[in-house]
């Protein structure tokens, strides 16, 4: 029985990608009045550009060139975090520190956190039914390609201190294969950036480990300190009291250690 | 505890000014959006408007633009609602309400007061 | 301005019954919507936000679903304090406008 459409080993397009994509569109430009001259029709269009009727294990990073430009964001390059593999506190984090912005932060990051989404070669439908696999299938998918491209140019524009939360639960704290570990540790640029300080965060309450201490980390400070940029790194040892703090740091409680 | 008190209401004849405030205790008032939203006698709730934590941002619905006015002072943990050339169809309870802190308001409203009475009536 | 319309706009049901009330958005809002709670001569009260999350301290018995145009507020086994009338909002664009509300009602 011949296979009229490909099947692909990861999950199709989330439902309702096109109205999902405008209405967050809409809501960013609304709630960040410096994005208010973005057309968010133009951005659906563009985004739509890039991966509709191509082959989704045929993606670049030129595909998304006109996303991109439409896209365009200046953030606070010295307020930049970065994260691995604990998203949920690093977001929890930047809504109450508002001066602070992960990638989901920007209008891009945040059009794309958490959907999913591919086309069909020569066809100008999108595939709700699978969509690649990056390592069953191929790494030039259109999720992963679009990470890349936004990771990539989000290290870029960073400067001074750039902070990244790392997930102290995990085998490897630092992961060389995460997108921090092979994107953003690579386009971080020396002559901008002067430290990158790691927050190690711990999952066990009683866990009093200097996970700084961690062989990974220790590889995160070689690479780091490779490239010319000087590395710091801090525990963060009651994750659930660093974000209560960060809330009211005139709580009495939040001069000792967290 | 987190509370809000609204106070200002009353008796106006149409045309004329109010100012309603909110006063909140029990948190950091300035790091919270915060709302207006009415009840008309009877029927459902209207939004009113927003103000951003810091007062950079500020929407209002269609029905009160060019009319009235959200501000804040974060040194009086106090809201305020400046209403001007008032018509009968503003009669409502006037409620004052909180965003939980997110940072794109998109988490609903978590903290009401109890609401303070406008009356336009000639 | 984004248009909701709740259905039923009133619903008469007993205490156990399992109800669910119906939120329309007139065009697509993701996940951006907001359940809410009110009684006679009250402020309301937030059940749900972000289509399906429990506001901290509300009973498990309301749950939310739905995104894009079509939403759900299901109470699973209705207690005789539930009886009230609900509300939706939506939080896409500014204004957040509401839903004209459902009566739930002892039958």
């Known amino acids: 029985v011949p296979r009229w459409r490909q099947q692909w080993s990861g999950p199709g397009t989330t439902k309702r990608f096109p109205e999902t994509v405008l209405a967050r569109c809409v809501k960013y430009t609304e709630i960040h009045p410096e994005m208010r001259h973005v057309d968010c029709q133009s951005v659906w269009d563009a985004f739509k550009g890039a991966f509709i009727s191509k082959h989704p294990c045929n993606i670049t990073e030129e595909d998304y060139q006109p996303l991109m430009k439409l896209g365009t964001q200046t953030v606070p390059c010295n307020k930049i975090l970065l994260w691995s593999r604990i998203k949920d506190l690093a977001h929890q984090f930047t809504q109450v520190q508002r001066d602070m912005f992960t990638l989901e932060d920007t209008l891009l990051g945040y059009l794309a956190d958490d959907l999913t989404w591919c086309g069909e070669f020569n066809t100008s439908k999108i595939n709700y039914q699978s969509c690649p696999d990056w390592r069953k299938d191929c790494s030039n998918n259109p999720v992963s390609v679009f990470w890349k491209t936004v990771s990539r140019r989000f290290a870029e524009a960073a400067c001074d201190v750039v902070h990244v939360m790392l997930n102290g639960s995990r085998s490897k704290i630092f992961d060389k294969n995460s997108t921090f570990g092979s994107v953003e540790v690579h386009n971080l640029q020396p002559e901008k950036v002067q430290t990158l300080e790691a927050w190690v965060i711990h999952g066990g309450r009683e866990d009093s480990r200097d996970l700084c201490q961690d062989p990974t980390i220790k590889e995160l400070e070689s690479i780091i300190s490779k490239r010319n940029i000087q590395f710091s790194c801090k525990n963060i040892y009651r994750p659930d009291k660093f974000l209560q703090c960060v809330k009211n740091p005139e709580d009495s409680s939040c001069t000792s250690e967290i | 505890q987190v509370q809000l008190v609204e106070s200002g209401g009353g008796v106006v004849q149409p045309g004329r000014s109010l100012r309603l405030s909110c006063a909140a205790s029990?948190?950091?008032?300035?790091?919270?959006?915060m709302y207006w939203v009415r009840q008309a006698p009877g029927k459902g709730l209207e939004w009113v408007a927003v103000?951003?934590?810091?007062?950079?941002?500020?929407y209002y619905a269609d029905s009160v633009k060019g009319r009235f006015t959200i501000s804040r002072d974060n040194s009086k943990n106090t809201l305020y609602l400046q209403m001007n050339s008032l018509r009968a169809e503003d009669t409502a309870v006037y409620h004052c309400?909180?965003?939980?802190?997110?940072?794109?308001?998109?988490?609903?409203?978590?903290?009401w007061g109890q609401g303070t009475t406008v009356t336009v009536s000639s | 301005d984004i248009q909701l319309t709740q259905s039923p706009s009133f619903l008469s049901a007993s205490v156990g019954d399992r109800v669910t009330i119906t939120c329309r958005a007139s065009?697509?809002?993701?996940?951006?919507l907001a359940w809410y709670q009110q009684k006679p001569g009250k402020a309301p009260k937030l059940l749900i936000f972000?289509?399906?999350t429990l506001h901290s301290g509300v009973p498990s018995r309301f749950s939310g679903s739905g995104s894009g145009t079509e939403f759900t507020l299901t109470i699973s086994s209705l207690q005789p304090e539930d009886f009230a009338t609900y509300y939706c909002?939506?939080?896409?664009?500014?204004?957040?406008?509401f839903g004209q509300g459902t009566k739930l009602e002892i039958k």
């Open positions: 309400a909180r965003d939980p802190g997110l940072r794109y308001f998109d988490g609903g409203m978590d903290v």
């Open positions: 029990g948190f950091t008032f300035s790091s919270y959006g």
């Open positions: 065009q697509g809002i993701s996940s951006y």
């Open positions: 909002q939506q939080l896409n664009s500014f204004p957040y406008t």
């Open positions: 972000a289509a399906s």
């Open positions: 103000i951003w934590y810091d007062g950079s941002n500020k």
